[in-house]
Amino acid sequence: ATKLTEEKYELKEGQTLDVKCDYTLEKFASSQKAWQIIRDGEMPKTLACTERPSKNSHPVQVGRIILEDYHDHGLLRVRMVNLQVEDSGLYQCVIYQPPKEPHMLFDRIRLVVTKGFSGTPGSNENSTQNVYKIPPTTTKALCPLYTSPRTVTQAPPKSTADVSTPDSEINLTNVTDIIRVPVFN
């Protein structure tokens, strides 16, 4: 059985979430990967995705989200810059592998963003910045519209910390390709 695990990140507005998703298998290196938010009772929403095929060390930017796939390490690096309180929520990485369902990567990320910029960021000390310079060679990738006969039967489990997610949508600029994909356990 799949064991859903979460990593909690507590950051201030203006800081950067900088995390990695481990995709384990070399066969997934070139697969398209996506960063999703999970809201209780809803299907995950894709906020950004890599190109197809996914290129090595090639930044893809969608609004304030930057994805970089490092094939040599089997890791997808995800950055969300200039965080806002409304970004709080549960996130996950998935690998698109049509016609099969997306392959979910652990751990899920429980992000808690609080008001007030602090010079002592704690858990994200290397990634604190109000102004973020976007790499010059970023690309915007179109995320595939993925459909499946399976439907959501239950909400994803809540964190033990039980952090509430704001009802408002995430305010990410230039996100034109938000899609829905099914939850699977």
Epitope: T2, V19, T24, Y70, H73, G74, R77, L105, S123, E125
Partner: antibody
Framework: AVQLQQSVAALVRPGASVKLSCTAS????????IHWVKQRPEQGLEWIGR????????KYAPKFQGKATITADTSSDTAYLQLSSLTSDDTAIYYC??????????WGQGTSVTVSS | EIVLTQSPASLAVSLGQRATISCRAS??????????MNWFQQKPGQTPKLLIY???NQGSGVPARFSGSGSGTDFSLNIHPMEDDDTAMYFC?????????FGGGTKLEIK
């Protein structure tokens, strides 16, 4: 070529601390995890913990909580392992390793730490 | 933590024959349809080398005579045909959950 270069052997007194270094070449440590592994003479391998250099987050084996502190300096692509309150049980070779496929690859050559009065 | 028990502790195999090393986990190391079991080889005076990751995937530059299998709690490393160069210690390691843990090791020698 991808490489991890570790600091030279250390001879330290009981009760003292030691800080080992591991410098990456051929890749940026921000883009991976760095792990540390202990191997006592003629014995097996023990995972100490790992760091995500991009955000400073660390994970440790319970046995090494309070004993080991893992840090990283991304400007020099160097990870560090500090060991405190050293005893003879800490005499070992300490390896840093890069990360691949949910495990460890790109091993450093190891640093021998000898605790002796 | 997940405890890994390797067997046998030592093994002698004739050149050209098959060597099989087993590793049993105290609980399943499967998650998301993947077995998080890895195998390392360590020769005397050398650093460990990744042979197999995720139960059955060969590490970079690893000869085809090394193969891994298993799922859940029971895994094995097979070496066939055995060569002189394969004399070493072999360790299994799980990366399903922290703390990552290693088996006690198996010493493989030529008979």
């Amino acid at each position: 070529a991808v490489q991890l270069q570790q600091s030279v052997a250390a001879l330290v007194r009981p009760g003292a601390s030691v800080k080992l270094s591991c410098t990456a070449s051929g890749f940026n440590i921000k883009n991976t995890y760095i792990h540390w592994v202990k191997q006592r003479p003629e014995q097996g391998l023990e995972w100490i913990g790992r760091i995500d250099p991009a955000n400073g987050n660390t994970k440790y084996a319970p046995k090494f909580q309070g004993k080991a502190t893992i840090t990283a300096d991304t400007s020099s692509d160097t990870a560090y392992l500090q060991l405190s309150s050293l005893t003879s049980d800490d005499t070992a070779i300490y390896y840093c390793t890069g990360h691949y496929g949910s495990t460890m690859d790109y091993w450093g050559q190891g640093t021998s730490v000898t605790v002796s009065s | 933590e997940i405890v890994l028990t390797q067997s046998p502790a030592s093994l002698a195999v004739s050149l050209g024959q098959r060597a099989t090393i087993s590793c049993r986990a105290s609980e399943s190391v499967d998650n998301y349809g993947i077995s998080f079991m890895n195998w390392f080889q360590q020769k005397p005076g050398q650093t460990p080398k990744l042979l197999i990751y995720a139960a059955s995937n060969q590490g970079s530059g690893v000869p085809a005579r090394f193969s891994g299998s298993g799922s859940g709690t029971d895994f094995s490393l097979n070496i066939h045909p055995m060569e002189d160069d394969d004399t070493a210690m072999y360790f299994c390691q799980q990366s399903k959950e922290v703390p990552w843990t290693f088996g006690g090791g198996t010493k493989l020698e030529i008979k």
